[in-house]
């Protein structure tokens, strides 16, 4: 069912031009161009592009979701189940998604069970990968060929809006009927969209996009979009480093910077400011990183430790140019990526049978393999960490105890709040509170609290939201097919009696308030059936989770070109410092932690279970040190002033691979090749790009000038406005008259 | 309305095969368990197995495994249960009945089949 | 297997009577029970399932309750069509078994 023929590709260029300018579709339908420098082949492309120079679109950025099974729609191509009430599954309507949340799935925030085995950075590691590898855009709130509804004001079943029905009894004081939902955006051309391709049809049924790269490439640090990579780094230093807030530090160490002033502001404004609502949130390779306070903390640690390794291999290699340093630095990165979610998360969830089974050791690249992330996997089987997530942020003293001035938040507290971290003793008492206090257990009849189902809070959303039955309603917008055809795709046997589900299911009650709302296994949403499994041995999920996430993280792994045990990504001697390494000694070279737990992932009392970092193994730099053979004619390659090169290889031969810095442009030859006369073109120029005469993108803002520079530009306000935070925009110093 | 109409008596001898079959009409027919139901002259229900028409998924009772097999056609909205191996005590009425899941009560039956196994 | 009991196996009663037919199954069964009623050449009719619910077209004088490993079915206010053999089945878990039925004869 993996198709890689893309529905457009073979449509001419000129009809997909005339198409795009109706539907804004061209940039996802053209094939990917697929440069053939040794550079390619060096460091992977920030899009997930050409991976796989068979199916360039494999694994990359704003493609569709890949389908295991065909979707099932009401109407055959686009309709959600659920769409028609009237609509029979098996001689039953399906049953609203609320009040599956509300018998099946939903406990008060007093009952947790705590995880005796694992810690919440655990949790926090599942949702931080899963940002790493899926994002499914959502069509805005008017459709896409006008006419559409918008979603906070209709409670009916309008596109782009497939809104979660409340039940009468228990609807808020306010009486409304239903909470928004917006269905993800249809990939161009399926469903609906079939209709401008002359293709509305079963055949070509409405498919959802990822917005991501779907390979573990650190996406959550550096980008999935060429454009956004360019608002992260830091154009201005030498070492590669990544961009870091221009004010705030935490005892010295950085944070992640906000977004640009001229985005929208969507989180939780700064504390004391009169008036405000709303405030900016952090910038980083993921636009979800101020989504929770763990979550940030993950992309804040990411973040340092980018820069940390920057300055250390720029210190390494000192001839290194500053993209060098940025991609070597990244390359890494992304490796420990790899390396803490399939060596330390991954058997840990599937437990160690099933990982054997589903994943297994490395056996080299795979070309057969389609690394892209699978609509049941990021629309239901990776989000069983959601039961795991607990409803209180816990922040500790140096001494792992309760933080005297920072309080257990409850997580509806801490939605969208950049400043929980910023003005909550930063990076290290949330570091704590991970790594020593256990993640919320996953139990039959306690799948999620109400800080998820009834104060789940969205800064865009006029009333809280509830998490579980998203999850189920998105899957039935997806088309996702039930619970039983998935578990026969796993080779699981289909569960077509009561007793045949409490074999799943070993809570008798949750069973029976299952199939009393379904009425018909085959019925059950694949979310809730999977996520209410009885665990594998050593196990965090069921069998039917333990092999669709298993079955994905193979792909993921296979299916990459720059998978880190790839002999061609990394020396023998890179790969086993790599091997060295884990996220507790992250943790230590990134935070004021001085103890830490060998294995960030298992819950532990302090100080008996904390190790000191001293002892804590980490990767030798000394491996990435480059040394040039003294027996070729070429001999240390020539700098351009103002550009970098970049080494690498191709037939043997050294290549030198030239970028200008940023604001200039190159004139020559991009790419040198070491011949036995030496090396065989000139170096090129590069040459100062004037940014102010960009009359279709103005560098400054309206309200500034702009004045070229060398290799840059400066915006210029006039007294009493300055410069604010972007560089780019003139605000009130504070010295207008009031 | 919802029919179920099984097809006419049999009499077969030791050894042989019985096929009944039961067309179904008034109905999402894929979307229903059909169920067979025996019962021996003056003895009580006995459950034979059921078929999932959609899927052709079936599942018996222990004492028929081996020796019975049901089938649906789709086209024509009709399930078949044969019975193979036939012996004295199979001498029953045979009904098919239908259900919309696996576990909630037979709600419709046919009028039943009568088999009769003699020498 | 899972074992169905039914009692008694046979009973009198007079018209207007009430009367009641348990059901035990040998494990718990939540409500997975239904309760049929057969007239003589005639097949099986559906009168309740999971436990209590009443089958649309049955006389409200026929109720079910129960679950676990205990069922009961009341028939109030006899009326001649209702003497007839009853039967209860689970659903639970394959086989469906059916219970050996209940004879409900005119004293």
């Known amino acids: 069912t993996q198709q890689s023929q893309h529905p457009t590709d073979a449509l001419s260029e000129d009809l997909l031009s005339i198409i795009a300018n109706m539907s804004g579709c061209l940039p996802y339908m053209l094939p990917p161009k697929c440069p053939n420098t040794c550079l390619a082949n060096k460091y992977r492309p920030i899009t997930g592009a050409c991976n796989n120079r068979d199916h360039p679109r494999w694994g990359a950025s704003n493609t569709a979701l890949a389908r295991w099974l065909p979707p099932v729609y009401e109407d055959g191509f686009s309709q959600p189940r659920g769409w028609n009430p009237g609509f029979l599954y098996n001689g039953f309507p399906l049953p609203p998604v609320r009040e599956v949340t509300r018998h099946v799935i939903q406990v008060s925030n007093e009952v947790v069970t705590d995880d005796d085995r694992y810690s919440d950075l655990l949790m926090a590691w599942g949702q931080y990968i899963d940002h790493d590898i899926a994002f499914t855009p959502q069509s805005t709130s008017k459709a896409a060929f006008g006419g559409g509804a918008d979603c906070q004001m209709t409670c009916e079943n309008q596109n782009p809006c497939f809104p979660i029905q409340l039940p009468e009894e228990a609807r808020p004081a306010a009486g409304t009927a239903c909470l928004p939902f917006y269905r993800s955006s249809a990939a161009c051309g399926t469903g609906d969209q079939g209709a401008l391709f002359g293709n509305l049809s079963t055949a070509n049924p409405r498919q959802q996009m990822n917005g991501l790269t779907s390979f573990l490439d650190a996406s959550t640090v550096y980008g999935s979009s060429p454009a956004l990579e360019r608002q992260l780094r830091n154009w201005t230093s030498a070492e590669g480093l990544l961009r870091v807030h221009a004010r705030l530090r935490d005892s010295g160490r950085a944070y992640l910077p906000f977004v640009p002033p001229r985005a929208p502001a969507a989180c939780a404004p700064e504390p004391g400011i009169p008036g405000e609502t709303r405030g900016p949130c952090f910038l980083a390779g993921d636009g979800r990183a101020s989504e929770v306070p763990s979550l940030t903390a993950l992309h804040t640690l990411w973040l340092r430790e980018h820069n940390r390794l920057a300055a250390a291999l720029k210190a390494l290699n000192a001839h290194w140019s500053a993209d060098a340093v940025y991609q070597e630095a990244r390359k890494v990165v992304g490796a420990l990526h790899q390396i803490i979610t399939l060596r330390d998360y991954i058997p840990r969830i599937l437990g160690p049978e099933a990982f054997q089974q589903y994943v297994g050791p490395y056996e080299g690249y795979d070309s057969t393999a389609n690394p892209t992330v699978s609509n049941v996997f990021s629309t239901a089987a990776f989000r069983f960490g959601h039961a795991t997530i607990h409803p209180l942020v816990r922040r500790l003293d140096a001494s792992f105890q309760e933080h005297p001035d920072l309080p257990g938040l409850w997580l509806h507290q801490a939605f969208f709040s950049p400043w929980t971290l910023l003005r909550g003793g930063g990076l290290d008492p949330l570091i704590r509170g991970l790594l020593a206090r256990p993640a919320k257990l996953q139990v039959q009849d306690q799948l999620m609290n109400e800080e998820l189902t009834e104060r789940l809070f969205v800064l865009s959303n006029s009333s809280t939201l509830d998490l579980a039955s998203i999850n189920l309603q998105r899957g039935r917008d997806h088309g996702l097919p039930g619970y039983n055809e998935w578990r026969e795709f796993c080779g699981l046997p289909r569960l077509e009696t009561p007793a045949d589900l409490s074999t799943a299911i070993a809570s008798r009650s949750v069973a029976d308030k299952i199939l009393d709302l379904y009425k018909h296994p085959d019925n059950i949403d694949v979310w809730l059936g999977g996520l209410a499994e009885n665990f594998l041995p050593r196990a965090r999920t069921g069998p039917l989770f333990a092999c669709l996430i298993g079955k994905q993280m193979k792909a993921l792994r296979d299916g990459d070109w720059f998978w880190w045990e790839n002999s061609h990504v990394f020396t023998d001697a890179q790969r086993r410092e790599l091997e060295k390494h884990s996220l507790s000694r992250v943790i230590c070279d990134n935070t004021g932690l001085t103890r830490v737990p060998m294995d960030a992932f298992q819950v532990g009392k302090f100080p008996e279970d904390f190790e000191s970092c001293d002892s804590i193994t980490g990767m030798n730099l000394e491996a990435w040190r480059e040394t040039f053979p003294q027996d070729d004619k070429c001999g240390f390659p020539e700098s351009v002033e103002n550009g970098d090169f970049v080494h690498c290889e191709e037939s043997g031969r050294r290549v030198l691979v030239y970028s200008c810095r940023h604001g200039y442009e190159l004139q020559g030859r991009e790419q040198l090749t070491c011949t036995q006369e030496g090396w065989d073109f000139q170096p090129p120029l590069c040459k100062d790009v004037n940014e102010c005469a960009d009359g279709a993108h103005p560098p400054c803002h309206a309200s500034a000038r702009c004045r070229n520079t060398k290799g840059g530009f400066q915006c210029l306000c006039a007294d009493p406005y300055e410069l604010g935070d972007d560089g780019r925009t003139c605000v009130d110093s504070g010295r207008l008259p009031r | 309305q919802v029919k179920l109409l099984e097809s006419g008596a049999e009499v077969k001898k030791p050894g042989a095969s019985v096929k009944v079959s039961c067309k179904a009409s008034g109905y999402t027919f894929t979307g229903h368990y059909m169920h067979w139901v025996r019962q021996a002259p003056g003895q009580g229900l006995e459950w034979i197995g059921w078929i999932s028409p959609n899927r052709g998924a079936t599942r018996f009772a222990q004492k028929f495994q081996g020796r019975v097999t049901m089938t649906s056609d789709t086209s024509i909205n009709t399930v078949y249960m044969e019975l193979s191996g036939l012996r004295f005590d199979d001498t029953a009425v045979y009904y098919c009945?239908?259900?919309?899941?696996?576990?909630?009560?037979?709600?419709?039956w046919g009028q039943g089949t009568t088999v009769t196994v003699s020498s | 297997e899972l074992v169905m009991t039914q009692s008694p196996s046979s009973l009198s009663a007079s018209e207007g009577d009430t009367v009641t037919i348990t059901c035990r199954a040998s494990e718990n069964i939540s409500r997975y029970s239904n309760w049929y009623q057969q007239q003589p050449g005639k097949a099986p009719k559906l009168l309740i399932s999971a436990a209590s619910t009443l089958q649309s077209g049955v006389p409200s004088r026929f109720s079910g309750s129960g679950s676990g490993t205990h069922f009961t079915l009341t028939i109030n206010s006899l009326q001649p069509g209702d003497f007839a053999t009853y039967y209860c089945?689970?659903?639970?878990?394959?086989?469906?078994t059916f219970c050996q039925g209940t004879k409900l004869e005119i004293k």
């Open positions: 089945q689970q659903t639970y878990s394959s086989p469906f």
């Open positions: 009945a239908t259900t919309r899941t696996a576990y909630y009560g037979m709600d419709v």
